[in-house]
Interface confidence: medium
């Protein structure tokens, strides 16, 4: 059918509460295209009854709610006019009550539902919430083993819960709890959170800054020879790496035959209170496929891409 | 000991923008976030947003879209900008910090600078 | 947004009394409140913060009770510089609210 397929990340979902996904693949969905969700390659679209259990509301899958048998390869069609992707979404649904005392045997947990506090820092912990625009979210409220957090050290800001002065008794498990409302209808949305204590701060008690790129396009003629840095801040004392992947894989291991895309050598210039690191990669020759296609920047938790595209003048006729 | 001291233009004419500039002493910005309140002629006080210690900003929903904050922490200086000023956005306006312990929000106040919006 | 109300707009006084200024937010904020004093002409001063523990300082006579919605400043033995605004503040939840505020009078 002429449709290029894109795979991308597994969902592990959690049963008997909303979930949407938003198919979105920036190189594609910032033109003029057409989105159309699919569940295991039926030919079949997914309902866009607003009414349906699983409908597709624009861009996103809706699932209201999840249900144990939703497990299941999805796709979502986004033609344009001259190009057609077919992405690849694995949800899996499990069982969970985030207050059982068995909080083990999730498998790989994305990294939504386990995160970070620095120790003696101000942090803060993230609600995520991802629905499309026809669902509107009630305030959100956070419980610690199952009970309401209320304590001093904590203020609720939109989707996050600000901890003051972090103390290692701050791990464990958290939820975040929502209710979400569609058509008049309401629904509780429970993320379970695991929470675990570094002593590590980050550049100014947070994760490292990309400063350059910043999730762009960037026009370069077939053919010719390319070299983008990474620059990133980041605290004196870290202990983070910083690369370049595509597909999720490291680009000297993703090239590692033909080499012609490498990272370079890492440099870094010392400031007071942080450094500044560089990090390049280098495309010999550009190629057909290298557009559309996200380089990462990966430093620590935090990612910026880049995407290839061929110069203006080549789209004319369009 | 922990200072805030705001700079301010006094008058300002409607839609035109306010800039107020809060220099810290006594602290570094890079361990601090600094809140931005202001205070009416009727006394009331009003949160309108901050800046966390790694330069990401959060704002009270009205001001969202004429309200920005930037800092130069080497400089121990942070910037206040409000676009659209109408009358009654007429207050004090001050940059404050928590205490160095839970809970003890706004512990320093700055000394507030006088914004009157005018014709 | 919770709302921090307080419902003495005025509170008229006398030296040595026992005074108490209530302030009422429209959500459990637990013991998220805290106290402010404010002189003609300066910056608000903390006084309370966790509803009831006392800023460094800040003298006895001033004590902060309560939980959940109901919060009460209590001023045990007031003295001329007492006379002040006082308001409260939540910090549960953003954004970030004060209440109207209480004026303390002499009779």
């Known amino acids: 059918d002429g449709c290029k397929d894109i795979f991308m990340k597994n969902e592990i979902l959690s049963a008997s509460q909303p979930f949407a996904f938003n198919c979105t693949f920036p190189p594609i969905t910032s033109g003029e295209v057409s989105v159309t969700w699919y569940k295991n390659s039926s030919k079949i679209p997914v309902s866009k009854i607003i009414q349906s259990r699983i409908h597709q509301d624009e861009t996103w899958i809706l699932f209201l709610p999840m249900e144990w048998g939703d497990s299941g390869v999805y796709q979502c069609v986004i033609k344009g006019r001259d190009s057609c992707h077919r992405i690849h979404v694995n949800l899996t649904v499990f069982e969970k009550h985030w207050c059982d005392t068995s909080i083990g045997g999730l498998p790989n947990l994305s990294d939504e539902y386990k995160q970070i506090l620095h120790l003696g820092k101000d942090d803060s912990l993230t609600c995520h919430l991802h629905f499309p625009k026809s669902c509107v979210l009630g305030p959100i409220k956070w419980y610690k083993d199952c009970n309401e957090i209320k304590g001093e050290r904590f203020t609720v800001l939109e989707t996050r819960l600000l901890v003051s002065n972090v103390s290692a008794e701050d791990r464990g498990n958290y939820a975040c709890q929502a209710i979400l409302t569609h058509s008049g209808k309401q629904y509780e949305v429970l993320n379970g959170i695991t929470v675990s204590i570094t002593e590590r701060a980050g550049y100014g008690g947070s994760v490292p800054k990309i400063i350059y790129p910043k999730n762009h396009s960037i026009e370069v003629q077939l053919g010719t020879t390319l070299i983008v840095d990474c620059n990133v801040t980041d605290t004196k004392d870290n202990t983070n790496l910083r690369c370049w992947r595509v597909n999720n894989t490291l680009v000297d291991d993703y090239y590692d035959e033909s080499k012609r895309i490498r990272e370079g050598v890492e440099t870094h210039v010392s400031f007071r209170e942080h450094n500044l690191y560089t990090v390049n990669i280098t495309f010999l020759e550009v190629k057909m496929e290298d557009y559309g296609l996200p380089f990462m920047c990966h430093a620590g938790v935090s990612t910026a891409y880049i995407i290839l595209q061929l110069p203006a003048p080549d789209f004319r006729a369009y | 000991q922990v200072q805030l001291k705001e700079s301010g233009p006094g008058l300002v004419a409607p839609s035109q923008s306010l800039s107020i500039t809060c220099t810290v002493s006594?602290?570094?910005?890079?361990?601090?976030?600094v809140h931005w309140v202001r205070q009416f002629p009727g006394k009331g006080l009003e949160w309108l947003g901050v800046i966390w210690s790694d330069g990401s900003t959060d704002f009270n929903a009205p001001f969202k879209s004429r309200l920005s904050i930037n800092k130069d922490n080497s400089k121990s200086q942070v910037f206040f900008k409000m676009n659209s000023l109408q009358i009654d956005d007429t207050a004090i306006y001050y940059c404050?910090?928590?205490?160095?312990?839970?809970?003890?929000?706004?512990?320093?106040w700055g000394q507030g600078t006088l914004v009157t919006v005018s014709a | 947004d919770i709302v921090m109300t307080q419902s003495q707009k005025f509170l008229s006084t006398s030296v040595g009394v026992r005074v108490s200024v209530t302030c009422k937010a429209s959500?459990?904020?637990?013991?998220?409140v805290l106290w402010y004093q404010q002189k003609i002409g300066q910056s608000p001063k903390p006084l309370i913060y966790s509803a009831s523990y006392r800023h460094s300082g800040v003298p006895d006579r001033f004590t902060g009770s309560g939980s959940g919605t109901d919060f009460t400043l209590i001023i045990s033995n007031v003295q001329s510089e007492d006379l002040a605004e006082y308001f409260c503040?939540?910090?549960?939840?953003?954004?970030?609210?004060f209440g109207p505020g209480t004026k303390l009078e002499l009779k």
């Open positions: 006594g602290f570094s910005l890079t361990n601090y976030a």
């Open positions: 503040q939540q910090y549960s939840r953003y954004p970030l609210t």
């Open positions: 404050a910090r928590k205490g160095g312990y839970s809970g003890s929000w706004f512990a320093y």
């Open positions: 959500q459990d904020v637990g013991t998220n």
